[in-house]
C-alpha cells in the first residue's frame, strides 16, 4: 500500500532571464528512493539516481543545475519554459510517486512564488 | 556480441508511411545503458539523426525538430526490437536509414553517449 | 544545433605517413561538470555503416588500431592516423552527443596519394 504523500513548491512564477529551484519532496513513507526523474511535458529534464547521481538530459546541460538535494535549478529561464514540470519518484517497495509544479516564467520583474500544496 | 538487424521496405510511394524495424540481439532494449536511434545518410543531408527511445524507469523519446510533427520511434519489449514511423514522406525522405545503439557509461553520463553498435543500414527510395 | 564544421573535405597521404582530420564545432561540446568533451570519430567504408573509432574526443574504442588517435578540447578537435594503412581509406566523421539534436561532421574522405 502506497502511504507516501509528495510535497511541491506548486505554482511558481519567476522572471524571464532569471532562475528558479524546483522542488519535491516524499514523506510519510518508509520507502526506500531509488531515483527521481524530472520531466516537463513528457521530456526528460535530468534523473538523480540513489546509485549512479546526477545527470541531466542533454538537451539541458546548460540551463539545468542539480539540486538543492533532489530538486532541480533551472536558468537563463525563457517564457517557453512555461508550464507543467513532474518529480516521479521511483520508490521500493511502494513504487512511483508523482509531484506537479506549474511554473510561469513572467517578462516583468515581478515574480512572486505560490503557496505550497500537496499531492497524495 | 550486440548486433543490430535492419528490416523493412525498400520502396515506399510519396505522401505514405515509411516503417523500419531494427531486431536487437546480444542486448535488450530495455537496457538502462543504451538509447536506441534511428539516423539516416544522404548526399544531400549527410548523417542525420532522426530520434531515440530509451528506458529510465521509464519510456522516453528524443526527436529531431525536422521531422518531429512526423516520426514515432517505439520500443518493443516483447520481441526485443524498436521500430521507426515516418509518416507523409516525400522524395526528400530516400536515404539509407540506420538503427544504432547509443551506448552510455552511466557513471559519466547516463544520458548520452556514442553510437557503438550500428545496424547493416537500408535503402529506402520515395518514389511513385 | 550545435554545427560541426570538418576541414579538409578529402585528404590524399602517402602510406606510412601521417593523416590529420580536423573537426570544429560552433560550440563547446565540454561538459563542466565532468571534464567530458562530448566528441567521437567514426570511420566509413562503402556500402558499410559508421564504425566507431573514438568517443569522449581521446578515448580508443575496443578493438581500434592505437595509429587512430583523437585530441582537442572545447571547440577544435582532430583525428590523427600517425601511420595510413590502405585498409584506412575511408570517409571520417565527427559527431557531437553534448546536445540534441545529435550532430555529424560533414565527412572527411581519405584517399592513398
Known amino acids: 500500500m502506497m502511504t507516501g504523500t509528495i510535497e511541491t513548491t506548486g505554482n511558481i512564477s519567476a522572471e524571464k532571464g532569471g532562475s528558479i529551484i524546483l522542488q519535491c519532496h516524499l514523506s510519510s513513507t518508509t520507502a526506500q528512493v531509488t531515483q527521481v526523474n524530472w520531466e516537463q511535458q513528457d521530456q526528460l529534464l535530468a534523473i538523480c539516481n540513489a546509485d549512479l547521481g546526477w545527470h541531466i538530459s542533454p538537451s539541458f546541460k546548460d540551463r539545468v543545475a542539480p539540486g538543492p538535494g533532489l530538486g532541480l535549478t533551472l536558468q537563463s529561464l525563457t517564457v517557453n519554459d512555461t508550464g507543467e514540470y513532474f518529480c516521479i519518484y521511483h520508490t521500493y517497495p511502494d513504487g512511483t510517486y508523482t509531484g506537479r509544479i506549474f511554473l510561469e516564467v513572467l517578462e516583468s520583474s515581478v515574480a512572486e512564488h505560490g503557496a505550497r500544496f500537496q499531492i497524495p | 556480441q550486440v548486433q543490430l538487424q535492419q528490416s523493412g521496405p525498400g520502396l515506399v510511394k510519396p505522401s505514405q508511411t515509411l516503417s523500419l524495424t531494427c531486431a536487437i540481439s546480444g542486448d535488450s532494449v530495455s537496457s538502462n545503458s543504451a538509447a536506441w536511434n534511428w539516423i539516416r545518410q544522404s548526399p544531400s543531408r549527410g548523417l542525420e539523426w532522426l530520434g531515440r527511445?530509451?528506458?529510465?524507469?521509464?519510456?522516453?523519446?528524443d526527436y529531431a525538430v525536422s521531422v518531429k510533427s512526423r516520426i514515432t520511434i517505439n520500443p518493443d519489449t516483447s520481441k526485443n526490437q524498436f521500430s521507426l514511423q515516418l509518416n507523409s514522406v516525400t522524395p526528400e525522405d530516400t536515404a539509407v536509414y540506420y538503427c544504432a545503439r547509443e551506448g552510455v557509461l552511466r557513471y559519466f553520463d547516463w544520458l548520452s553517449g556514442a553510437f557503438d553498435i550500428w545496424g547493416q543500414g537500408t535503402m529506402v527510395t520515395v518514389s511513385s | 544545433d550545435i554545427v560541426m564544421t570538418q576541414s579538409p573535405d578529402s585528404l590524399a597521404v602517402s602510406l606510412g605517413e601521417r593523416a590529420t582530420i580536423n573537426c570544429k564545432s560552433s560550440q563547446s561540446v565540454l561538459y563542466s561538470s565532468n571534464n567530458k568533451n562530448y566528441l567521437a570519430w567514426y570511420q566509413q567504408k562503402p556500402g558499410q555503416p559508421p564504425k566507431l573509432l573514438i568517443y569522449?574526443?581521446?578515448t580508443r574504442e575496443s578493438g581500434v588500431p592505437d595509429r587512430f588517435s583523437g585530441s582537442g578540447s572545447g571547440t577544435d578537435f582532430t583525428l590523427t592516423i600517425s601511420s595510413l594503412q590502405a585498409e584506412d581509406v575511408a570517409v571520417y566523421y565527427c559527431?557531437?552527443?553534448?546536445?540534441?539534436?545529435?550532430?555529424f561532421g560533414q565527412g572527411t574522405k581519405v584517399e592513398i596519394k
Open positions: 527511445t530509451y528506458y529510465r524507469s521509464k519510456w522516453y523519446n
Open positions: 559527431q557531437q552527443y553534448y546536445s540534441t539534436p545529435w550532430t
Open positions: 569522449w574526443a581521446s
